[in-house]
């Protein structure tokens, strides 16, 4: 999700951005911090057993505009939020899983609490 007024065409940042990374740390990250010319992100998605998994990290400028747009994928519950306003800004992102649609109850596996 983007801040209001942010253009859709990604413009190059004049400086590197540092992001927190978790489950998504590239080889060049240090102490769970990665660097990018694009965006920091936090994403929540369901794993194969239907449990929510949160990952965070860096998205390069190339292609990040599309990835941050958070377009729904059929039969996949997932939400991503992106930010650029300060270093490690993704520590403060808390995306939530989209609500289950009725069809998901029918088609998807049944999970008991």
């Amino acid at each position: 999700k983007k801040e209001d007024g942010e253009s859709t065409a990604p413009t190059p940042r004049p400086k590197v951005l540092r992001c927190k990374c978790h489950h998504h740390c590239p080889e060049d990250s240090v102490n769970n911090i990665c660097s990018t010319d694009g965006y920091c992100f936090t994403m929540i998605e369901e794993d194969d057993s239907g449990l929510p998994v949160v990952t965070s990290g860096c998205l390069g400028l190339e292609g990040s505009d599309f990835q941050c747009r958070d377009t729904p994928i059929p039969h996949q519950r997932r939400s991503i939020e992106c930010c650029t306003e300060r270093n490690e800004c993704n520590k403060d992102l808390h995306p939530t899983l989209p609500p289950l649609k009725n069809r998901d109850f029918v088609d998807g596996p049944i999970h008991h609490r």
Epitope: K15, V16, R18, D28, V30, C34, D37, C58, E88
Partner: antibody, heavy 116, light 112 residues
Amino acid sequence: QVQLQQPGAELVKPGASVKLSCKASGYTFTSYWMQWVKQRPGQGLEWIGEIDPSDQYTLYNQKFKGKATLTVDTSSSTAYMQLSSLTSEDSAVYYCARFGYYVDYWGLGTTLTVSS
Amino acid sequence: DIVMTQSPDSLAVSLGERATINCRSSQSLVHSTGNTYLHWYQQKPGQPPKLLIYKVSNRFSGVPDRFSGSGSGTDFTLTISSLQAEDVAVYYCSQSTHVPFTFGQGTKLEIK
């Protein structure tokens, strides 16, 4: 044009601390990181760390943690590096340098001499 | 830490001849974004370093076109196609892919 102004020299006694300054002009101070680099006489370059003036976020070379502290004053577009518990090993030229994805402009450097 | 090793340590070249300086990194300098943050600096006595080449092969503004950079992964080269008297200096390669950022030990270039 981009300029990074540093005092030419500082003379400090062993065990003391010193705060080196770097005044930036000719660009938007918060749009670039500021790095600090050490060069001992006749030797190579050592990266100390960097600070993002827009949010005061710092990254340090592990070797200089506890030795160097980086700060900025955005109102005067000035970056500072405090060096503590000085010894003769800290005698060197210290450069501030503007960093985006690489260092493109350097200050002229401050020659720090630690001597009693 | 990434170790940057330059060769040779010193180099004497005749005016108008080609000078080549090599730089090898202990790990790949290809960043996760796809960029390679390998840069070259020139330092003359009593002066700060000056940026010559950024991201392997891009000449910084005002740098003469006799300076060029090439390479990929872990192996990089700075070439001066026709040495001029004002090119006498120490040359450093530097990487900003991995924290802490590191420099080569320097190559001293002199006139033969």
